[in-house]
């Protein structure tokens, strides 16, 4: 439960974070679990502890193993484990699965690829980026802070991306590389003139006097996240809040349900204790977005209770 997997390549820097968190002023002790040997804090050592962090500068295959960190707080000690594996560098271009960080997906609108674990290191821009071992060149690729931005993403941009940067520790430089897969989602979002799915235009809704009634206004506005979209009810052309009848309230239903990939909104009109005068009102379901406004009108009619004869 309190264990985290970390991996790196021999002769590169690797910095590992203790899985237990605490306040900056808490002392953190590190041990090599197999021998219970304390990890030194002096920076002259190749492997040393620095608070929440354990640093391998640089890492060696023999460093592989489980490391214990103990965060010492005023009332109890919290123990965590870092499972560290250091791999030999591959001679060929393929990055094996065990060296891959989590896959990220992007689309035409959002194509940021973050360099994994970089926040742990003392690095300076620019980052170098590679795709399938080839250095990325061209105006479509922009290394920005700790991420890569790809303009006009296409399906061919899917693949394994490696970031390479230099970690600086007391004037000494160490190389770090990290690789993750990038997949491209075909997320062509669009916006349409609102389509009201319910109620039907000029629908007659049967209600029972004295009972509660619900009317649902449901509309779709296109695909993907919508910049501006709303559904609401009006009574005789007046907003519900301005109409001033506390028995009649509206509340949001499914807030943005992507059924069939469509962005839809629901608004439920709740009428408590239906009265005769409610049958005289005009109920308008309104759906609006940047394209315009669509309105469907509903009227209420009395539903005669069914007589039960023995």
């Amino acid at each position: 439960k309190f264990s985290k997997q970390s991996w790196g390549l021999e002769n590169e820097a690797l910095i590992v974070r203790c899985p237990r968190q605490g306040k900056p002023s808490y002392t953190v002790d590190w041990y090599y679990s197999q021998t219970n040997k304390s990890i030194p804090t002096q920076e002259r050592n190749r492997v040393f502890a620095s608070g929440q962090l354990l640093k391998f500068l640089p890492a060696a295959v023999a460093d592989s193993g489980i490391y214990t960190c103990i965060v010492r707080s005023p009332t109890f000690n919290r123990t965590g484990y870092a499972n560290v594996t250091i791999y030999k560098k591959q001679s060929d271009c393929n990055v094996p699965d065990y060296l891959m960080y989590s896959t990220v997906s992007g689309s035409e609108k959002n194509s940021k690829i973050y360099c994994p674990t970089i926040d742990l290191y003392n690095w300076t821009a620019p980052l170098e980026w590679f795709k399938n071992c080839q250095a990325l060149q061209g105006s479509r690729y922009r290394a920005h802070k700790s991420f890569l931005v790809i303009d006009n993403v296409m399906t061919e941009d899917a693949g394994d991306y490696t970031c390479k940067f230099i970690h600086n520790e007391n004037g000494a430089n160490y190389s770090v590389t990290a690789t993750r897969s990038f997949t491209v989602k075909d997320e062509q979002g669009f916006s349409l003139f609102p389509v009201i799915g319910a109620p039907a235009q000029n629908e007659i809704k049967e209600v029972e006097i004295g009972k509660n009634a619900n009317l649902t206004c449901s509309a779709c506005f296109g695909k993907g996240t919508q910049f501006l979209a709303a559904v609401l009810w009006q009574l005789n052309g007046t907003k519900i809040t301005d109409f001033g009848e506390p028995r009649i309230q509206q509340e949001e239903g499914q807030n943005q349900s992507f059924s069939n990939g469509l962005a839809c909104l629901d608004m439920v009109l709740r009428i408590a204790d239906v009265k005769e005068e409610d049958l005289l009102l005009q109920y308008d379901c309104l759906a609006l977005n940047l394209h315009g406004l669509r309105r469907h009108t509903v009227r209420l009619s009395r539903k005669n209770p069914i007589d039960h004869h023995s």
Partner: antibody
Framework: QVQLVQSGAEVKKPGASVKVSCKAS????????MNWVRQAPGQRLEWMGW????????TYGDNFKGRVTITRDTSASTAYMELSSLRSEDTAVYYC?????????WGQGTLVTVSS | DIVMTQSPDSLAVSLGERATINCKSS????????????LAWYQQKPGQPPKLLIY???TRESGVPDRFSGSGSGTDFTLTISSLQAEDLAVYYC?????????FGGGTKVEIK
């Protein structure tokens, strides 16, 4: 700059649940735990619990155990607090606050009103 | 649980005068492991979240004016505003930052005399 942005006000009926979100920006989310604190009208601040954002391990205050669930989504740099079986005395402003020496960074607060 | 008791409940002070708020904890907030007192002070204005003023009983948070100071150790702590300004009108809270559950004092309302 560090920012914690919380979800909007909620009105709930007794017995219902509420889930409040807290989106962090301006720092590395998994480097710091996230606390949840509430303040009922005219009452003192009350710590509800915190979550280790790195491994997702929550710790709850005794007063809330069994009713509160604190989670996080590292990909969205967001922490969540869900409180169930709401009662009128849960009407309060709920805050997220980043762990540190004291709580230097707070969300703007989310008013949860429990009313029948 | 550690109980935090603040006094007074409210305090009326003239502008430019000194304001002193006390806070007592039911258990020591001193951690012998690093000799830190885990006590924090906050200022809260209406409609706003609390703002951290002091942590570690006496360390001022960056950006906090130096008229705010904290002192004390173990179970007895004090927040002092050396020369009260109009913008200091607020409720002040102390907090046990030592052990779970983190607990807060009942607050002290500072007003202008």
């Amino acid at each position: 700059q560090v920012q914690l942005v919380q979800s909007g006000a909620e009105v709930k009926k007794p017995g219902a649940s509420v889930k409040v979100s807290c989106k962090a920006s301006g720092y590395t989310f998994i480097n710091y735990g996230m606390n949840w604190v509430r303040q009922a009208p005219g009452q003192r601040l009350e710590w509800m619990g915190w979550i280790n954002t790195y491994i997702g391990e929550p710790t709850y205050g005794d007063n809330f155990k069994g009713r509160v669930t604190i989670t996080r989504d590292t990909s969205a740099s967001t922490a969540y607090m869900e409180l169930s079986s709401l009662r009128s005395e849960d009407t309060a402003v709920y805050y997220c606050a980043r762990e540190g020496e004291g709580f230097a960074y707070w969300g703007q607060g989310t008013l949860v009103t429990v009313s029948s | 649980d550690i109980v935090m008791t603040q006094s007074p409940d409210s305090l009326a002070v003239s502008l430019g005068e000194r304001a002193t708020i006390n806070c007592k904890s039911s258990q020591s907030l001193l951690y012998s492991g690093n000799q830190n007192n885990y006590l924090a002070w906050y200022q809260q204005k209406p409609g706003q979240p609390p703002k951290l003023l002091i942590y570690g009983a006496s360390t001022r948070e960056s950006g906090v004016p130096d008229r705010f100071s904290g002192s004390g150790s173990g179970t007895d702590f004090t927040l002092t505003i050396s020369s009260l300004q109009a913008e200091d009108l607020a409720v002040y809270y102390c907090q046990n930052d030592h052990s779970y559950p983190y607990t807060f004092g009942g607050g002290t309302k500072v007003e202008i005399k």
